[in-house]
Amino acid sequence: RGVFRRDAHKSEVAHRFKDLGEENFKALVLIAFAQYLQQCPFEDHVKLVNEVTEFAKTCVADESAENCDKSLHTLFGDKLCTVATLRETYGEMADCCAKQEPERNECFLQHKDDNPNLPRLVRPEVDVMCTAFHDNEETFLKKYLYEIARRHPYFYAPELLFFAKRYKAAFTECCQAADKAACLLPKLDELRDEGKASSAKQRLKCASLQKFGERAFKAWAVARLSQRFPKAEFAEVSKLVTDLTKVHTECCHGDLLECADDRADLAKYICENQDSISSKLKECCEKPLLEKSHCIAEVENDEMPADLPSLAADFVESKDVCKNYAEAKDVFLGMFLYEYARRHPDYSVVLLLRLAKTYETTLEKCCAAADPHECYAKVFDEFKPLVEEPQNLIKQNCELFEQLGEYKFQNALLVRYTKKVPQVSTPTLVEVSRNLGKVGSKCCKHPEAKRMPCAEDYLSVVLNQLCVLHEKTPVSDRVTKCCTESLVNRRPCFSALEVDETYVPKEFNAETFTFHADICTLSEKERQIKKQTALVELVKHKPKATKEQLKAVMDDFAAFVEKCCKADDKETCFAEEGKKLVAASQAALGL
């Protein structure tokens, strides 16, 4: 009973143009093109988008016009393949254009780059931005979409429209304010941080679909929606899961127009049926479309219904478990996951999926045994260690976070992860460990009932960043193993890794530890990254260094930076004191 049972349309492009409206159509086509051709200049993309839009308008006027019956992939692929510099700019991606649909689109998808070689986005002065905004608002906002989309090729397109709307609102309000910077900069910082988080969350959804298949994504969705909508019955949750899977499959597959259209339909359906879904949707459903969809996606969990009986009766104590499992596997396991998840908003989604997998594995084994009931009677006892492992890990790490604070907690994780997988590039280790460390300030403030879903599901998102970055240039078999064996066991897999004893320490290179006066003008965050980069390099040179040794070197390093940044002749200080620091560090670490 999915909501997306549309009649066939003579012209798909006309259909989507009419459904979405010109503004959203153009924005989504721009996002799609920028996510595929990440190196193309802005102006080239705008030209392509305008051509597609003009063509779509001809199809709206006459659906039988030439080429209007072609699929969106055919139309968009043909347009992308007209780019003159495709071979020079993208190399083998140009070979995609020799293929037919659907292979051509698959080829483009495979060439999406999670870490494109693009310059860091530097924020201009506020007055410069406000002038640009006022001079040409449309171009200014398109440029925002383009810059985000090309750097985040899996960004959830309908959600990017929501970000763009907030971006526009921030400039509209703040460029008229007395203190433009005080008004605008915090808003832009918030959008940047939320945008990065949104991109990473969506990247995990796409990885789940693309690497582990639709069944894995659906299981994730059943668990999450059952936690969020515990009063909704199983059929309702199943229907939402089917529709949500379609939406994300489309967006992850580059079908952004269909995705945005279907997401709007899903939001409409949810709001029309909120009485049977959740009592928490009322406010969301009063908002305009983009805000509504975002709000629904972030809505808090509804209260658990009263009178939920024990699950043991149906799933453990009954002698008919194997008959029910054998005759209706997917429904039975789906019902188990739904029932367990709606009773446990205090568990992470990945833990719930581990429990469901354990239950399934037990039934597979026991239903073939001589006495199945005797065999599966203690299955819930097997859940105890699975539940306690993340609980203990979170307790220990939150204690460590509270003791150290975020920066030093990140450093502890940097050391931990560099020792586990020292082959991984330093920028990746720094980025991932910094993000892992943010779990502290994000989740440790929560009461126990909310800590695990916050922490472990966030860690899944961050570890997926490691997995996708590592996949581009694989250097560690251990990372590959943890990333590919099981989606839900990634975090326990990485947690279980010990120091890599096979690693041959990196040759010492003084240049890596040479610093200059430019460090003094960096923001606090950038300065932290410099220090954390040095810390990773230290561990790569001396993987067996103790915490105390590393702390001593890092303290000396911090003092050195502080001293030289206060010096009159900073550059000389950095050169002379730097040499001394390197020598002292080498001695301290026995290099």
């Epitope: 019955e233 199983f234 059929a235 309702e236 049977s276 009178d307 939920l308 009986p309 024990s310 043991a312 009766a313 149906d314 799933f315 104590e317 009954s318 002698k319 008919d320 008959k323 029910n324 005759e327 209706a328 429904v331 039975f332 019902m335 029932e339």
Partner: antibody, heavy 120, light 108 residues
């Protein structure tokens, strides 16, 4: 409003057949195990059988063979087909919703019942 | 299939009394027992599930206890509206379920 409404009861000759219906509103039948329970005048409650979310039907030992439970999710209705009826089948027949898709109990939601009389 | 024996089959009491009804299973059913109240011309109403969990909206004077084979329903302070027939139901051991034969509670 969440409710169950039974229909199809009435008077039938011994040896005859009858099909009872239980129409659900306010929820989807497919999410639950749906049960039939009967009660002869002044007597105990007697469970007949149920059909679960996997479309698997289970019956009380005495009901196997003569009674069949089915459902039509598109009509949100569950049925009880009764054959070879006897005088002792005279009772009020209730439809009741299980707690979950594979639950045999407890039953929080019941219909008001439909009366079946088997006599010549 | 297991059997449930309810006792007594009938019971007379006065408003304000404390009343206890028992239900015995022929084999262990863990805590999978429910108690229902039924009034003439009405379907049964769920009072207690999983032996001791009170259904929402049911007054707290009703309580259940027991596990394995022996179960008890207690009404701590009988009210006029409590005079009815009470049934126990065992479930969960298989995909079948069984009811006790009822206890009729009447005014003394």
């Amino acid at each position: 409003e969440v409710q169950l409404v039974e229909s199809g009861g009435g008077r039938v000759q011994p040896g005859g057949s009858l099909r009872l219906s239980c129409a659900a509103s306010g929820f989807s039948l497919s999410s639950y195990a749906m049960n039939w329970v009967r009660q002869a005048p002044g007597k105990c409650l007697e469970w007949i059988g149920h059909i679960n979310a996997g479309d698997i039907a289970y019956y009380a030992t005495w009901a196997k063979g003569r009674f069949t439970i089915s459902r039509d999710n598109s009509k949100n209705t569950v049925y009880l087909q009764m054959n070879s009826l006897r005088a002792e089948d005279t009772a009020t027949y209730f439809c009741a919703r299980g707690a979950g898709g594979f639950s045999t109990g407890p039953f929080k939601l019941w219909g008001q019942g439909t009366q079946v009389t088997v006599s010549s | 299939a297991f059997e449930l024996t309810q006792s007594p089959s009938s019971l007379s009491a006065s408003v304000g009394d404390r009343v206890t009804i028992t239900c015995q299973a022929s084999e262990s059913i863990n805590s999978r027992l429910a108690w229902y109240q039924q009034k003439p011309g009405q379907p049964p109403k769920l009072l207690i599930y999983d032996a001791s969990d009170l259904t929402s909206g049911v007054p707290s004077r009703f309580s259940g206890s027991g596990s394995g084979t022996d179960f008890t329903l207690t009404i701590s302070c009988l009210q006029p509206e409590d005079f009815a027939t009470y049934y126990c139901q065992g479930y969960g051991g298989s995909s079948t379920t069984t009811f006790g034969c009822g206890t009729k509670l009447t005014v003394l």
